[in-house]
Interface confidence: low
């Protein structure tokens, strides 16, 4: 009975090579797939008796593993079925075909190769979705989500990496980070800002070759405004004496923001100056080697009672400033708490 759509049969075939064992063919199947590995001699010439092995050990047929002379079937594939499969000549032990099998969580999307399409995907990468790559210039309003896609294939399955203006591009290079969806050959940037403008290049490569595609992103300015801070951040924290604490602040800004972390302090018993401005000390500010990502987090190590109090994330740009504050409460260590309790004191946090 043929499997239903949710349990696809995925076939992979390799040509029998000359005297040298074939290049190991990398293949990926989805969990639950019925896997077929075929070893076809050119022109249909008989290969003689063959055996199949997995990771060097001969495979024995079972209710789930069906072994034929030039074909191996594994039903309902699972992660344990991943490994190196080889089809060998039974007498000479010459390797006729070599497969490196990966089993992923998702069921395969059914690239169901027929016999006549043998190994058609072997070799250098190529674009599989040309019509989705026509739009090379993308102009989007600020705060929108942008997705660049470079759907490709090849054998072995190629890797994809991204460049921005010719340099390696990683999540820490922008506020809000990036999403790399390798399964979908895509780069996603949420809440784009003008500093995201530039040329984005996907580089798709395997050992047989490399292809690339460059997209140009233009971010259209909205009416300028001061930085926007994500609601609820930083959040109030309660910590035990001697523990570590992190405050987070998420900043969205069209113009390049300047981020500082401040702690509110008292001067001569007063929290504010004569003009009503709070007394603060700057704990963290942009330096030569500080990334925006690093500035979005304030880390306090081995906190003391002196660390308790009000902390502010201040973000400014050419238009103005925004700030959010949070409180840190420091509790005594458990032993101290027990001692105070026994003395009959009440601690109000």
């Amino acid at each position: 009975e043929p499997p239903g759509p949710e349990q696809r049969v995925v076939r992979r075939a390799a040509e029998v090579p000359g005297p040298e064992p074939s290049q190991q063919e990398q293949v990926a199947f989805g969990s639950g797939d019925t896997v077929e590995l075929s070893c076809h001699p050119p022109g249909g010439a008989p290969t003689g008796p063959t055996v199949w092995a997995k990771d060097g050990t001969g495979l024995v047929a079972s209710h789930r593993i069906l072994v034929g002379p030039q074909r191996l079937q594994v039903l309902n594939a699972s992660h344990e079925d991943a490994g190196v499969y080889s089809c060998q000549h039974r007498l000479t032990r010459r390797v006729l075909c070599h497969f490196s099998v990966r089993v992923t969580d998702a069921p395969s999307s059914g690239d169901d190769e027929d016999g006549e399409d043998v190994a058609e995907d072997t070799g250098a990468p190529y674009w599989t979705r040309p019509e989705r790559m026509d739009k090379k210039l993308l102009a989007v309003p600020a705060a929108n989500t942008v997705r660049f896609r470079c759907p490709a294939a090849g054998n072995p399955t190629p890797s994809i990496s991204w460049l921005k203006n010719g340099k390696e591009f990683r999540g820490e290079h922008r506020i809000g980070g990036i999403k790399l969806r390798h399964q979908q050959w895509s780069l996603v940037m949420e809440s784009v800002v003008p500093s995201d403008r530039g040329n984005y290049t996907c580089v798709v490569e395997n050992k047989f070759g490399s292809i690339r595609q460059t997209y140009t992103l233009d971010v259209l300015e909205r009416s300028p405004h001061r930085p926007i801070l994500q609601a609820g951040l930083p959040a109030n924290q309660t910590a035990i004496l001697g523990s570590d604490v992190e405050f987070h602040c998420k900043v969205y800004s069209d113009a390049q923001p300047h981020i500082q972390w401040l702690k509110h302090v008292e001067v001569n018993g007063s929290k504010v100056g004569p003009d009503g401005t709070p007394y603060v000390t700057v704990l963290k500010t942009a330096g030569a080697n500080t990334t925006d990502k690093e500035l979005e987090v304030l880390s306090l190590h081995n906190v003391t009672f002196e660390d308790a109090g009000e902390y502010t994330c201040l973000a400014g740009n050419s238009i103005g400033f925004s700030h959010h504050s949070a409180w840190l409460v420091v509790l005594p260590a458990e032993e101290e708490l027990m001692e105070t309790d026994e003395a009959g004191s009440v601690y109000a946090g």
């Epitope: 190529y126 674009w127 040309p130 989500t145 997705r147 399964q183 979908q184």
Partner: antibody, heavy 120, light 112 residues
Amino acid sequence: QVQLVQSGAEVKKPGASVKVSCKASGDTFTDFEIHWVRQAPGQGLEWIGDIDPETGSTSYAQKFQGRATLTADRSTSTAYMELSSLRSEDTAVYYCTRTYDGYPYAMDYWGQGTLVTVSS
Amino acid sequence: DIVMTQSPDSLAVSLGERATINCKSSQSVLYSNNNKNYLAWYQQKPGQSPKLLIYWASTRESGVPDRFSGSGSGTDFTLTISSVQAEDVAVYYCQQYYSYRTFGGGTKVEIK
């Protein structure tokens, strides 16, 4: 098992709008594109457009540009097709269907269809 | 837009006979980089949603009987049912997915 479940039949007057929904289950909604195809009684299949639920980016057949609006709600894994300024020739079964973001890019799963009748 | 033209409009065949449906695209749907034809075939039985039969012009979707086969390249394609069964009575559509999506007009297959 992937399923695309569409909203029920609609009867509309000419000039009105209709909004058909398509709820996806059994797979990651943002891993595929949702397409809308219609079929007038006794006629062939006609592609309306598609939406990428990840970003909301859409493409439309020229004929439907400006009259059809495709949207997607990632939180409920539901896609919507709204057709405005309805006329009698819009009477058709409207299907949602999907194409995977990997192979094979053909429409491998289809909804059951929603009959939209435009009549005064 | 790429226009897809199917022929014939309808086809009456005896059980067990061969049925051949043709599809022509107004421009090539073959992508030279991967040598794949961006063409699919669908089957629609009366009162049902369409069902994917063939993609990449010649690759059968899983679960589709092997009496269905697709061939052709560039602009000319053929769907062949090698031995028509009663359950094959349906309308068959070709569709290109090289540039957006367009369908052929459909071919109705009936039993003589």
